[in-house]
Amino acid sequence: EDELQVIQPEKSVSVAAGESATLRCAMTSLIPVGPIMWFRGAGAGRELIYNQKEGHFPRVTTVSELTKRNNLDFSISISNITPADAGTYYCVKFRKGSPDDVEFKSGAGTELSVRAKPS
């Protein structure tokens, strides 16, 4: 069976300040078991934007119902975008582990740019 792929179809998205940004991500498989996380940036300093497993992310909503059986859509929407939100966002699949989940595969990233709010 083919190994899971993380698909971020848009290389870039441009949003006006104050609006919401939709960042799309899809998986090609339900296996392996483990959560999805979204990060801004990569490397040691990457910023956690959304964790399917736990946490409070008031500006983030999921586009589809993640708990729905056989769901493969892990797109998110971030509200009230500001220039500080600009950057490259990665959708990352983790494999369930003990004691910690392990990064399994990442999408190629979607660069979010922020336009000035229309006057």
């Epitope: 490397g43 300093g45 910023e47």
Partner: antibody
Framework: QVQLQESGPGLVKPSETLSLTCTVS????????WSWIRQPPGKGLEWIGY???????NYNPSLKSRVTISVDTSKNQFSLKLSSVTAADTAVYYC????????????WGRGTLVTVSS | DIVMTQSPDSLAVSLGERATINCKSS????????????LAWYQQKPGQPPKLLIY???TRESGVPDRFSGSGSGTDFTLTISSLQAEDVAVYYC?????????FGGGTKVEIK
């Protein structure tokens, strides 16, 4: 341009808590991560931890039990507390800015020497 | 933790000559999703904070002279000063920011021969 300035006592007694503040001037604290790094006299660099303006933190496991980093976005400041200090914590302490979009710590404060001694 | 090993500990180079510093990481710092190596190089002069020279292993920071260049991928990296100037006398550090904890090499002291 953006500048970082560390402040705090230069002398701390053993077993007490070291407290330093880094003030970010000329720019916003948003969008970057803000690190503390230390350098014992004549030695190399050791990363202590970082914080985002959201308050999310990441600490060096070797110091995690003694370290707290906090942020005050209204004052454009972030702070370091290191508890139960010993002479081994004597070092120049630097604050620095990191960019998760590129990598590397691209802006550093001048550093402040903290001596642990009774 | 990722261990960063620099060599040599020190080197003396004549003015105008090439200086080469090596850095080896105990595991790869290449992120396959964006094909970037999370490896940076810093210059530190006495009494001053470190200054970022290179990030992503080979991208020069703004304002850094082009005699400084970085190369390598995965676990093996090199900082080259193509023509050493008197103001380049300093200690140079490599650093990985691929995984936390962020870690630095032990430093290489560059002097004039």
């Amino acid at each position: 341009q953006v500048q970082l300035q560390e402040s705090g006592p230069g002398l701390v007694k053993p077993s007490e808590t070291l407290s330093l503040t880094c003030t970010v001037s000329g720019g916003s604290i948003s969008s970057y991560y803000w690190s503390w790094i230390r350098q014992p006299p004549g030695k190399g660099l050791e990363w202590i931890g970082y914080i985002y303006s959201s308050g999310s933190t990441n600490y060096n496991p070797s110091l995690k039990s003694r370290v707290t980093i906090s942020v005050d976005t209204s004052k454009n400041q972030f702070s370091l507390k290191l508890s139960s200090v010993t002479a081994a914590d004597t070092a120049v302490y630097y604050c620095a800015r990191g960019d998760s979009s590129s990598g590397g710590l691209d802006l550093w404060g001048r550093g402040t020497l903290v001596t642990v001694s009774s | 933790d990722i261990v960063m090993t620099q060599s040599p500990d020190s080197l003396a180079v004549s003015l105008g000559e090439r200086a080469t510093i090596n850095c080896k990481s105990s595991q790869s710092v290449l992120y396959s999703s964006n094909n970037k190596n999370y490896l940076a190089w810093y210059q530190q002069k006495p009494g001053q904070p470190p200054k970022l020279l290179i990030y992503w292993a080979s991208t020069r920071e703004s304002g850094v002279p082009d005699r400084f260049s970085g190369s390598g991928s995965g676990t093996d990296f090199t900082l080259t000063i193509s023509s050493l100037q008197a103001e380049d006398v300093a200690v140079y550090y490599c650093q990985q920011d691929f995984l936390t904890p962020i870690t630095f090499g032990g430093g290489t002291k560059v002097e004039i021969k």
